[in-house]
């Protein structure tokens, strides 16, 4: 027979020879890091077919690291379901707890013994320091010094000293999150008041109010013979400006009797089309309304702004 087979878990006792005679026996032993569990054979014989009798290293078992218990409020998860050396142990904490120590330990061979690469971690309860204080507002549980996981606080604004109330900008409720960090930034309390939205040749049709505070929503429509340039719905944003800007109502041009003239694309910026808070520089685009919205009217010629009554 030629050289005997080699194995992952066991090695030949003695030096291998170039060839062996029929009937000759070779013995194996478990490699370092493996140990023998009877009764499987760990030897083989060169048979008369010039082949080695079947043998396997199934009798040699990997050394295993000591059993690790689940950490309190967490779990120890063996990577391949095994504690054998060369493998990893992963640690995870239950919701509301965080890991102190190594998230992964390695089962390593020290001499002929398998040991873990470090100490098992522990799971500590997630705790948050008190959330931020805000100007012109307060939060619930302001007397509490330590907050546990998912504990929530709700912010509210103080009464305003003037005629206009403080608006709460942002989410009113935040909670103590995963990494001992609050779920989001604290909201802000400030006076938000948008100007009265003036639309020439049009009028407000909903969202009427004495004053327009944060998130106030207003809708407009144009007078007959005018079309809306901009959005028909605007919302008072946190900067006390209308978003999108207050629209304009532009005149629908009468039908021309013959073929239309070439357009010059110059914009007549008649001051009568101005409305408050329309401070964007440069002329605003003029949109052609769909014809179907204005039966009996043609499309307006682009670039002509005219808002005479």
């Amino acid at each position: 027979c030629e050289e005997p087979p080699t194995f992952e878990a066991m090695e030949l006792i003695g030096k291998p020879k170039p060839y062996y005679e029929i009937g000759e026996r070779v013995d194996y032993k478990c490699k370092k890091g493996y140990f023998y569990i009877p009764p499987l054979a760990t030897h083989t014989i060169c048979d008369r077919n010039h082949t080695w009798l079947p043998v396997s290293d199934d009798a040699c078992y990997r050394e295993t690291c000591p059993y690790i218990r689940d950490p309190l409020n967490g779990q120890a998860v063996p990577a391949n379901g095994t504690y054998e050396f060369g493998y990893q142990m992963h640690f995870i904490c239950n919701e509301g707890y965080y890991l102190i120590g190594e998230e992964i330990l390695y089962c390593e061979l020290k001499g002929s013994v398998a040991i873990w690469s470090g100490k098992p971690p522990i799971c500590e309860k997630v705790l948050c320091t008190p959330p931020p204080k805000i100007k012109n507002g307060k939060h619930t549980f302001s007397e509490v010094e330590v907050f546990e996981y998912l504990d929530a606080v709700t912010y509210s604004c103080d009464p305003a000293p003037g005629p206009d109330p403080f608006s709460l900008i942002g989410e009113s409720t935040i909670y103590c999150g995963d990494n001992s960090v609050w779920s989001r930034a604290a909201p802000e309390c400030k006076v938000v008041k948008c100007r009265f939205p003036v639309v020439e040749n049009g009028k407000q049709i909903s969202g009427f109010g004495k004053k327009f505070y944060y998130k106030a929503t207003v809708m407009f429509e144009c007078d007959k013979g005018f079309y809306l340039d901009g959005s028909d719905t605007i919302v008072c944003d946190s900067n006390s400006t209308w978003d999108p800007p207050v629209p304009k109502c532009l005149k629908v041009l009468p039908p021309s009797s013959t073929k239309p003239p070439a357009l010059s694309h110059s914009v007549s910026t008649s001051s009568t089309t101005k409305s408050p808070a329309s401070s964007a520089s440069g002329p605003r685009p003029t949109y052609k309304p769909p014809v179907s919205n204005y039966p009996g009217y043609p499309k307006p010629e682009e670039g002509i702004l005219d808002s005479l009554d």
């Epitope: 008041k193 100007r195 009028k203 407000q204 004495k210 001051s271 408050p276 808070a277 329309s278 401070s279």
Partner: antibody, heavy 118, light 107 residues
Amino acid sequence: EVQLVESGGGLVQPGGSLRLSCAASGGSVSSYDISWIRQSPSRGLEWLGVIWTDGGTNYNSAFMSRFTISRDDSKNTAYLQMNSLKTEDTAVYYCERVYDGYPWFAYWGQGTLVTVSS
Amino acid sequence: AIQLTQSPSSLSASVGDRVTITCRASQGISNYLNWYLQKPGQSPQLLIYYTSSLHEGVPDRFSGSGSGTDFTLKISRVEAEDVGVYYCQQYIKLPWTFGQGTKVEIK
């Protein structure tokens, strides 16, 4: 608190022109929306137009072709330019600060009298 | 333009009387209506804004109500200093317009 004082009124012939001034003290004219309103026994109170803080204007269409509102920030003054004056333009003219961006007229001055007569 | 019609055009009341002035709009104006008082020899002064909100410094004997097209100004107990001409003003639509006025006298 800003005070607005009207001036420039007087006697003018029909077809003539006149420029009224509205001077601000105790504040900047550009920080406020300023309306012009007039009052006459025959026509009562009439809103003429407004100049907004951003410089934009809106007019009463009945006067738009003859009246123009402007502002000179360096002089801290708003103006009402009136052209082609008619006898029915005889009135007391007020400049008025629009209340905090809302069309409520809470700050009336004493007004300036314009008389259009030949 | 939206027309505002006030009634009565004038009235005479005794001190302590309850006075009611109405203002009717030619089309719906929601609550976008203000009231002014012009005392003899003075400029107008704002009394009430947005139909019913008292301007600062205005006595609470003044009250406003209404919505849409019909509005009312009430003086619960009229006083001598309340004489003058009362005007309503709408601001839902340009041009902003005023009523023709209601003259209030004390008997």
